[in-house]
């Protein structure tokens, strides 16, 4: 505990100290004060350096004196035979004695006391930055007017900071400007504008006079300007060394200004105001801004319109524009959306075509649809190129965004027929020469193909079964060979209106209207053995002559056989109707005149016996077609006849190319549309 | 009509083999496919082969592969069917059968040839 | 190949009784099904082809249906004469391979 005075007394005092002794005394006086240490009596053992006995004085880490030997007053007026004055409030006085003495020495009385020092002038570092007012005991630190003591309660300096300016307009200036600015202070003044507008700083190089850098360059006394993560200086020196309009990019700025204690010189004066916020006009390839401005600032809205073939992508919903307004931070907003390449996607494929996988499916792309040749070709033109148009689809010149559509090649046979060996007046044949043959089974007869959803036959084969069962694609009928052919399944049979339905159709004498439709369930798959044979035309380039030749082929009985294994087939020529009432019935089921003979038959063969027979009936009678003779039409139906090997009765199908697209057309679905 | 006449009733040892023939009447073999079928005695159907004339191949069922052969003589309008490598399963009749048309399977029978193998 | 399994291999029945006999392909084999009887030292005769179509000469007694892989003959009312061994056939596949039989006899 602290004390303000007190005694310190050798060992035995005052008798002789005992040898080997070591003791300390630890002097504490309250805080402020310093000590006063004085000696009374001193009679220790003397030696050189007083190695030997000594007492020992030592403050903090210093040795205030080291005492040995006798000692008397110079002064006969005070006993006081040696003193210490030391300026700290705390003292260490050791004694220490040797192994032996010579002599009997009494040892030393010593005498403390706490002293007023005077802080304001006792030591090296002056402890105020201005006035020092000595009390006993402590101190305290003074400010001349306008100075306010800092809470370390030693600095004084001016009441400069805390100013928070928000005008949008203003002046700043150092304290007392033009007047010297004051010494050690440290001033803060804050700008707070409304966000989105920037503070922008003048200054003119005259309006700034700080306290120059020293040798190594760092300013002794500083002004700095801090916008958020930027910083601005420290500037210092005889005119404003910075750039003279401070464009900070933020609506926040700190001016901090810091001087030292010495050298001051009349400061600085700067004006700011604030700027709406400029956001940078970017560069966004493939569009247009409107309004183009040489500047955009905060608030400012743009509306940016992509190019053609370009559009902004957000989520999976495309557009062709968007607007984007300058924020407070001075960045654009939407700034993520670009305008892209439309991208019209993966093509779409088309039925019986393909279209090649595209190196690009973006804008300005180009993809070329091929239907399957030679068995289908592009039906609605256009040439099968597309490209990717800026609406995002694919575009055909002709067609626009319309697919193409392959639809089947008709009349064309993959290999054409050769007649061989004659074959009870006919040829063996391939389903390759008469790839539109179509083999019903039950009645045992024929049809023709004549697009992916129709078969065309005689209205005798289908009067007596609704739901026929079919097959295309094979030369031979022989089951093994139907289960690996296609077979075709019925969803509708329409029978000509104008053939007479009868209850004993065995009886039958009049074939005309002999024509039927098959409406198939499903489309037919075009190939080398399975393709249309065409539909007459209208004009009267299609109106048969006697003698025009034309193709049959069936699966009828032959001279041989009653039912063919093999297509058979055979060249014919046409003939007068009245060759074919010439001819006597040879199983008559009435009277010869009982027959009708109309204008919509065809009597053709009598050459070299050959002829259609039963089970050949509804097949084609193939003639060429007269505008393109790589094709063949079908001109007739097998329909009767009164004689096989002579001739024979073929529906004139020319006279019904009405009803049959009229019924295609009321019969369709939407995907054959 | 077709008719279909199989050659007389085999005797024949382990390992030997057989050849049955069946000729036909009332059509031309290159107007008919020819199946070979066999039943053994007390027991099921069992289909052998046929000679495909479309596809100018023959095609076997997989359990006589590599022992039966299947041949046809168009000039004489007859068809052979060789069995080897005999074995006491192999006791059975064998029968000659035409293909039908237009989904019918099988058309003609012949009468069958039994053909018993035994030591 | 394609495996066929016919059930049952035996089945016990009364005249007038109503018998169905099924056939299973191991995969389609579409309508290419053919149904056969036998009576003993006999050749077997064709009654249904194309799984559903009744041969001609067939009493309509007896009916096939089914298609791709199930298949059933029924013979509506057991006739005496109807006592024999049923087969099927499929003909879908380049072999043509039979069931393995359902032997009709008298309960």
């Known amino acids: 505990e602290p004390t303000m005075y007190g005694e310190i007394l050798s060992p035995n005092y005052p008798q002789a100290y005992p040898s080997e002794v070591e003791k300390s005394w630890d002097i504490e006086v309250p805080e402020g004060y310093g000590i006063h240490l004085y000696f009374t009596h001193l009679d220790i053992e003397l030696s050189e350096n007083c190695a030997y006995d000594s007492v020992q004085i030592i403050s903090g880490d210093t040795e205030e004196g080291r005492l040995c030997g006798q000692r008397s007053s110079n002064n006969p007026h005070s006993p006081i035979v040696e003193e210490f004055q030391v300026p700290y409030n705390k003292l260490q006085v050791i004694f220490k004695s040797d192994f032996s003495n010579e002599e009997r020495f009494t040892g030393f009385a010593a005498y403390y006391v706490a002293t007023d020092i005077n802080e304001c002038t006792d030591f090296v570092d002056v402890p105020c930055s201005h006035f020092c007012n000595n009390f006993i005991g402590g101190y305290f630190c003074s400010c001349p007017p306008e100075y306010f003591l800092h809470d370390d309660m030693k600095n004084c300096g001016v009441n400069c900071s805390g100013d928070v300016f928000t005008a949008l307009i203003g002046e700043i200036a150092s304290p007392n400007y033009p007047k010297p600015y004051p010494e050690n202070s440290r001033c803060e003044y804050q700008i707070r504008l409304e966000k989105g507008f920037q503070v922008v700083v003048t200054l003119r190089r005259e309006d700034f006079d700080v306290e120059a850098a020293d040798s190594a360059g760092n300013c002794l006394d500083s002004l700095v300007f801090v916008a958020g993560d930027r910083q601005f200086g420290p500037y210092c020196g005889h005119g404003f060394p910075g750039p003279l309009n401070i464009e900070t990019k933020s609506n926040a700025l700190d001016i901090i200004f810091q001087t030292d204690l010495t050298g001051q010189k009349k400061g600085w004066k700067l004006r700011y105001h604030g700027d709406p916020m400029p956001c940078p006009k970017e560069d966004t390839p493939n569009s247009v801004w409107e309004p183009a401005k040489a500047k955009y600032v905060f608030r400012d809205v743009v509306q940016i319109t992509c190019l053609d073939g370009f559009e902004v992508v957000e989520g999976r919903v495309g557009a062709t524009s968007f607007y984007s307004t300058c924020q407070s931070n001075g960045k654009w907003s939407n700034s993520k959306l670009k305008c892209q390449p439309v991208d019209c996607g993966i093509p779409e494929s088309i039925e019986n075509g393909k279209v090649e996988d595209p190196e690009s499916t973006l804008f300005g792309s180009v993809i070329r649809y091929t239907c399957e040749e030679p068995y289908y070709y592009m039906e609605n033109g256009g040439g099968g190129e597309y490209h990717c148009a800026g609406n995002g689809s694919w575009v055909n010149e002709v067609l626009g965004p319309e697919l193409p559509k392959c639809v089947p090649v008709c009349g064309v046979p993959r290999e054409p027929f050769e007649e061989k060996q004659r074959i009870i007046g006919g040829s063996d044949a391939d389903i390759k020469n008469f790839p539109w043959q179509v083999f019903f089974d039950n009645p045992w007869a024929g049809g023709a193909l004549i697009n992916e959803y129709w078969v065309l036959t005689a209205a005798h084969v289908v009067e007596g079964n609704r739901e026929p069962t079919m097959y295309v694609g094979s030369t031979s009928v022989q089951t093994s060979r139907l289960a690996k052919s296609k077979m075709l399944t019925p969803e509708h049979v329409f029978i000509h209106p104008g053939w007479k339905l009868l209850e004993v159709p065995e009886g039958r004498t009049n074939f005309d209207n002999d024509i039927a439709l098959v409406r198939l369930k499903d489309p037919v798959k075009m190939g080398p053995t399975v393709s249309p044979i065409c539909l007459p035309g209208t004009s009267s380039d299609y109106n048969l002559m006697d003698g025009d030749l034309g193709l049959i082929s069936g699966w009828g009985r032959t001279e041989k056989r009653d039912r063919a294994v093999r297509l058979k087939a055979a060249r014919l020529p046409v003939a007068p109707l009245r060759k074919c009432k010439e001819v006597k019935v040879e199983k008559p089921t009435a009277d010869a005149e009982a027959y009708v003979f109309t204008p919509n038959m065809i009597c053709a063969g009598g050459e070299k016996g050959m002829d259609s027979c039963k089970g050949d009936s509804g097949g084609a009678f193939a003639v060429q077609d007269p505008n393109d003779k790589t094709k063949f039409y079908a001109a007739g139906l097998v329909s009767w006849g009164p004689q096989c090997g002579t001739y024979g009765l073929y529906t004139r199908v020319k006279n019904y190319v009405d009803w049959i697209m009229k019924t295609m057309q009321e019969n369709s679905t939407p995907r054959e549309d | 009509e077709v008719q279909l006449v199989q050659s007389g009733a085999e005797v024949k040892k382990p390992g030997a083999s057989v050849k049955v023939s069946c000729k036909v009447s009332g059509d031309t073999l290159t107007e008919l496919s020819m199946h070979w079928v066999r039943q053994a005695p007390g027991k099921g159907l069992e289909w052998m082969g046929t000679f495909d004339p479309e596809e100018g191949e023959t095609i076997y069922a997989q359990k006589f592969q590599g022992r039966v052969t299947m041949t046809e003589d168009t000039s004489t309008d007859t068809a052979y069917m060789e069995l080897s490598y005999l074995r006491s399963e192999d006791t059975a009749v064998y029968y000659c059968?035409?293909?039908?048309?237009?989904?019918?399977?099988?058309?003609?029978w012949g009468q069958g040839t039994l053909v018993t193998v035994s030591s | 190949d394609i495996q066929m399994t016919q059930s049952p291999s035996t089945l016990s029945a009364s005249v007038g009784d109503r018998v169905t006999i099924t056939c299973r392909a191991s995969q389609s084999i579409s309508s290419w099904l053919a149904w056969y009887q036998q009576k003993p030292g006999k050749a077997p005769k064709l009654l249904i082809y194309?799984?559903?179509s009744l041969e001609s000469g067939v009493p309509s007694r007896f009916s096939g249906s089914g298609s791709g892989t199930e298949f059933t003959l029924t013979i509506s009312s057991l006739q005496p004469d109807d006592f024999a061994t049923y087969y099927c056939?499929?003909?879908?596949?380049?072999?043509?391979?039979f069931g393995q039989g359902t032997k009709v006899e008298i309960k």
């Open positions: 056939q499929q003909y879908n596949s380049p072999s043509w391979l």
């Open positions: 194309k799984a559903s």
């Open positions: 059968v035409t293909e039908g048309l237009a989904g019918i399977p099988f058309d003609s």
